[in-house]
Structures are given as structure tokens and as C-alpha cells.
Amino acid sequence: GWVWNQFFVPEEMNTTSHHIGQLRSDLDNGNNSFQYKLLGAGAGSTFIIDERTGDIYAIQKLDREERSLYILRAQVIDIATGRAVEPESEFVIKVSDINDNEPKFLDEPYEAIVPEMSPEGTLVIQVTASDADDPSSGNNARLLYSLLQGQPYFSVEPTTGVIRISSKMDRELQDEYWVIIQAKDMIGQPGALSGTTSVLIKLSDVNDNKPIFKESLYRLTVSESAPTGTSIGTIMAYDNDIGENAEMDYSIEEDDSQTFDIITNHETQEGIVILKKKVDFEHQNHYGIRAKVKNHHVPEQLMKYHTEASTTFIKIQVEDVDEPPLFLLPYYVFEVFEETPQGSFVGVVSATDPDNRKSPIRYSITRSKVFNINDNGTITTSNSLDREISAWYNLSITATEKYNIEQISSIPLYVQVLNINDHAPEFSQYYETYVCENAGSGQVIQTISAVDRDESIEEHHFYFNLSVEDTNNSSFTIIDNQDNTAVILTNRTGFNLQEEPVFYISILIADNGIPSLTSTNTLTIHVCDCGDSGSTQTCQYQELVLSMGFKTE
């Protein structure tokens, strides 16, 4: 049978020919009668055999990491007969490892983020090196990790490559660290190969700094003319943290928050001082407020860094503005009777300069030919007033500072013209009526009514009478209905068209004013032939036709 031991060849042998071992048949008595042959993978190119002795040699440098085993076949032939002495057999040549590969970090680049102020022992990252050498061959691929750079803040576990924090770090002092890790094979023994990697460790921010005002005093100014909501200046606190941890909120201490407010601009982290209530230089020309600042987000466990809020004092100076005159009232309403003579007193308006210099004021009434105003604000009539033409005047009074005519104020002035009884009542329309020749006594021929242009405090009441002449010698009479109307009645039987075709009746109408006014109004009454029907309609129709120039049969 075949006789051999297991074959090993060390990798990376530089000799031109390296003896591996011997293949032989136990029938071989050493007299060179047998011929040994090598077949299969690498036969002739990588491995050769001494045909006489069966000694096997490697004739090429081998790399275990490239190929670690070769399966070959061996034959032994009797030279004399040319026949196989043993059956063809497979055998294996294993390439044995040497420590020719350094550890390599395959997952580079390494980068880790860890919160600042993390306690000792906090895991940062694990780095892993791999070694192409045979892990089953001694310590060729057994690695030890060590820290070349990064003390005293970091440490590495020698066998796992786990990097941990060994000392608290403050991001505000240094926000990133380069750590250099070395991996050595042979568990660090002499002859070990090594590889290194760099790890960038970034510290993430925690809210361990409160915002602090860099200035203990801010001086701001505000114009007294500034409207509410006006931004009058900014204040700024600084927070060494970043991002969300540097977001802050400004506020005013409660006692000082009547006139001013502070809002936070979350983009710039500035405090904007705004006017909450209008200021008046003449009333108060300076203010002092205390502002405070706090972080927007503070986790409970970090409250120890935020016990007392930083404060600053803000002095605000009010700037004087030349303000227009100020009227005592927002508007004025005066009353004056109609028909009062020119120059009659209407009322007094008053405006003052709110500024400290107290400029004299000049007044004027815009667009009015009816009223005058003097420098004292006294308003008088410049024309006689007639309520029946205009009962109200809507005017505008302007006050102008004498020393600065650009400072003007205007307010409304309403003048009501009060009524006096200066109009007598009169017919509400022109009355012309008809009476038939054959009309009987007491026949109603017209109802009349009156109007009065005056305004009545109570209801108007009119009194109707015939004039003295008509009362004494009248074919007609009047009855007052007591409702501001009256009726005209015939006072006799029968009228004669030829003798007296028209009657003109004078009617007196008096009002209930004080003093009472009376007017005389003429009622025209036509006499007409009404026919048998006695209808005034017919009479009206006939008269109408006649008046139009038509002849009737």
C-alpha cells in the first residue's frame, strides 16, 4: 500500500525548491525499479515529484491566503512491466500559515457621536480589524487593540475593540476628537504585525449652559409718537450650547411689564423690546425694566445648570416729539337760535400744545361763511341763520401751533340751529273749488289743510277762521275740524252764475307758536251750472271743457 504522512508546505517560501515529504509504496525495496508520478492540481507547475524516490517538492512560492490546499493524485508504476504497482490515490497538500498579513480595518472611515458630559464607561463605537492569516494557526490572527491617541478621554477594550469614554468631555471646550486605534496580531507578542485606524468622535451638545446676558445694562430710546407694537431695540444673551439647546426665551420681570414687552426672535435668538402701551414724554420721559432669559428646552436632569436665570437692566429714554395741539374734547356740539344777529356767540373750543413749550394756538373753521372763530376759540355767527334753510352745520375746527404751523389738529364741530316761530301756517296747496247754482245751504264744498315751515316742539296746531269781512258778509262758512284741517260749507241756498260767477274767500290760519303767527289764504270758488243732478263733478267737467275751449251742447 501507499505510505505517506500528511503534507504541509509553509507559505511564502523563497527557495526554488522546498521538500514537502515523500510518497512511497511499501513494495518499493529501493532498487529504483518503480517510477512515481504526480497528477492533478498544480502537478508539474507548483509541485514536482522525484520519480525514483517519491520525494515531493514545492517549486513555487505559495500564498495560503490565496489557496490553502491542493488535491493531487499519485501513481506508482513498475518500470519493468509498465503496470501500476498501487491503485491511483488522492492526497492533500496543505499550505501552512505564516504571519504575513497585518490586521486591517475594513469598515473605515469610523465616525461616532456621543453626548458631551457622558459618564466614564459610556460605549462610543466598536472598531473591528480582520487578519487574513489563519485563525486556527497559533496567534497569527489573534488581535489585540490599543489606543495610540485619545488618552485620557477614551479607552479601548483590548480584545473587542470597543471604545469607551474614560473621562468626561465638555463640547464647549472641544467638540471633536481624533482617536487612533492600533490592532496587533500575535496577541501583541514580538514579531506581531499591526494596522491602525482613525476614529472621529464628535461630541453632541447637551444643555449644560444657560444663556447669559453679556451686557448688564442696555440703553434704548423710543419716540413718544411710536405706535404700540413698535420694536424699539434688541437685547442679546449668549449660550455656549448649540442648536435646540441654545434656543432661548426672553421675558420682562412681572413688575415691569406694563408698558413694554419682549418677544424672542427664534431665528436670531435676540430679544426684541416692543412697545406695549403708548408713551408720553410729557408724562414720563424714561423707564427702567429688568429682562431675564431662559432656555426654551431644558430636560429635568439638566435643571441643575439652569437654577437662576440671567437678567439685565434696560433703560429706555422717551424722545420728545413736537405733537399737534390737543383739543379738550374729541368733538364739539353747539346750539344757536335762528335769526340771531350777526356776531352772536355760539360757543368756545379749546386746544392746547401738549409739549412742554406750550405754543399759543390759532383756530380756524374750514369751509364756513356762516361762523367765525377767534384766537381764544370763541365761535360767533357771521351771518343770520335760517333753520328752515339749514338746521345743522357739520364743520371742522383746526388748531394750529403758532410756533410750528405744521402742527395741526382738526376735530368736528356740529352746530344745531334752533327754531324760532318765524313762519305762519299756510295752505298746504293751492285750493280752487266749485259750487253749483242750485247748491243748498250747509253743503261741504272743500276740505282744506295747512303746513308750517317752523319746527314745533310740540305738535303743530292750526286754527282756521274766515276773515272779518267774509265772516260778516259771506255766502260761505268754515268749520275747524281740530285736526289741522277745516271744511268750507255753503252758507245760503242758490247761487247765480251770471251775477256772481266767482267768490274769493279769505281764510285766516293761525299757529300755536309763541308768539302766534297768522296768514291770510285765498280760496277761489267758481259758481257753475250743474244741471238737475247737482253734481259738482259735472260742474268740474264742464268747467274743465270750457277752459279747454270746447263747446258743449
Epitope: G40, A41, S45, D63, R67, S68, I71
Partner: antibody, heavy 120, light 108 residues
């Protein structure tokens, strides 16, 4: 898992050099124990091994093509390449790249292949 | 150079039948160095068997390989519709690596 992808021109003029690249993804070309191989298949015919390379640069070629073949590796790009010079119409084939287990010699996995036509 | 001869060139069978494919080497090949591949039209070959008899990952157990020396066999115990393809053997024993000419298994 490891995947391979061939790339290169689909048409090459006669007498010119055919150049293909195989990009390896899902694993490192620098892993020990593997060869990175090129195989071709003439239309309607069988498979022909061209050669392979170890990532450290050692090459093994089919003697029938050795004079015209160069296989190279770029570990930084995780790629290996084939150059076949002085091509003729007989080099028209689908070219595959594949990973070879160095100890036992089987091909797995393979790229999907790219057809290269040699024509003027 | 080791020449691998595959037979038959074409095998016409019905689904469910048994397929036996032969690969003969021109000289002895270590069984550790013989592999079988399946190739479907328009696709790359796929490893089925390595070391003459070991199934690759994900290969159904209806595929089996055997043989040594110069004679190797691939058996498909019960043909499924997706098994109709071309099958190649390949050796790594002696350089250059070589493939057989292939056996086409087609539907009868």
C-alpha cells in the same frame, strides 16, 4: 450577498482590443480564498475559461488565449478587468465574470453576462 | 488539457421523468474538483453541484451528483418544468479549467 456586473462596449472592431470591467458589490474583492475569473460563451456553444486573478495581482490564463489576454484588478474600486487584444470575429461571445473558490475551483456567483460583437 | 465529454447531447423527457446526464473526463479527475452548472436561455450559468456530489445553496434535493475518476453523473430524480435547460460539467483538477460541451434537457 456578493453580486457581479460586467460592463464595456458591445461592439469592437477587428484587430482592436476588447476591454471589459466587472464590478463586485456586496463583498470585498480583497477577500482571501477567491479568484476572480472571466469565462466566455460563443453563440450557441459551450463555455470557455479565459483566466482569473487573485486580488494581490497573481494571474492564471488559459494557454489557448494567454498571448492576447490581460486580467487586472483595482481593489480601491472593487473591480477587475479583462483586455483581449487583436480580436477577430471568432472572439464574438457573451463574456461572463465570476468568483472562483480557489481551493476547489467552482464558479459562484456569476455576472449576468455581456455580449461583445467583433465586427467592422 | 482535460477534455470533458457530455452525453447525450440532447435528452428529450417529460416532466416527472428521471434524467441522467453523463460527464466523461479524458483523464482521471479528483472528485473534489468536479462541478455541475445549469444554464437557461439568456441567463448566466448557475452552480448546482460541487465536489462531484455536494449540492450548492438553494438547490432542490431532486438534483444529485456522483462519480469519480473519469466518470461523473448528474441525476434529476423527477423533472420539473423549470429544469428544462442546458447542463455543463467543469473540472478544476488540471490547468486549464475546462467545461463539457453541455447536455440539453428538453421537453418531449
Amino acid at each position: 450577498q456578493v453580486q457581479l456586473q460586467e460592463s464595456g462596449p458591445g461592439l469592437v472592431r477587428p484587430s482592436q482590443t476588447l476591454s471589459l470591467t466587472c464590478t463586485v458589490s456586496g463583498g470585498s474583492i480583497s477577500s482571501g480564498g477567491y479568484y476572480w475569473s472571466w469565462i466566455r460563451q460563443h453563440p450557441g456553444k459551450g463555455l470557455e475559461w479565459i483566466g482569473y486573478i487573485y486580488y494581490r495581482g497573481r494571474t492564471y490564463y488559459n494557454p489557448s488565449l494567454k498571448s492576447r489576454v490581460t486580467i487586472s484588478v483595482d481593489t480601491s474600486k472593487n473591480q477587475f478587468s479583462l483586455k483581449l487584444s487583436s480580436v477577430t470575429a471568432a472572439d464574438t461571445a457573451v463574456y461572463y465574470c465570476a468568483r472562483v473558490y480557489s481551493n476547489y475551483g467552482w464558479f459562484d456567483p456569476w455576472g449576468q453576462g455581456t455580449l461583445v460583437t467583433v465586427s467592422s | 488539457e482535460i477534455v470533458l465529454t457530455q452525453s447525450p447531447g440532447t435528452l428529450s423527457l417529460s416532466p416527472g421523468e428521471r434524467a441522467t446526464l453523463s460527464c466523461r473526463a479524458s483523464q482521471s479527475v479528483s472528485s473534489s474538483y468536479l462541478a455541475w452548472y445549469q444554464q437557461k436561455p439568456g441567463q448566466a450559468p448557475r452552480l448546482l453541484i460541487y465536489g462531484a456530489s455536494s449540492r450548492a445553496t438553494g438547490i432542490p434535493d431532486r438534483f444529485s451528483g456522483s462519480g469519480s475518476g473519469t466518470d461523473f453523473t448528474l441525476t434529476i430524480s423527477r423533472l420539473e418544468p423549470e429544469d428544462f435547460a442546458v447542463y455543463y460539467c467543469q473540472q478544476y483538477d488540471t490547468s486549464p479549467l475546462t467545461f463539457g460541451g453541455g447536455t440539453k434537457v428538453e421537453i418531449k
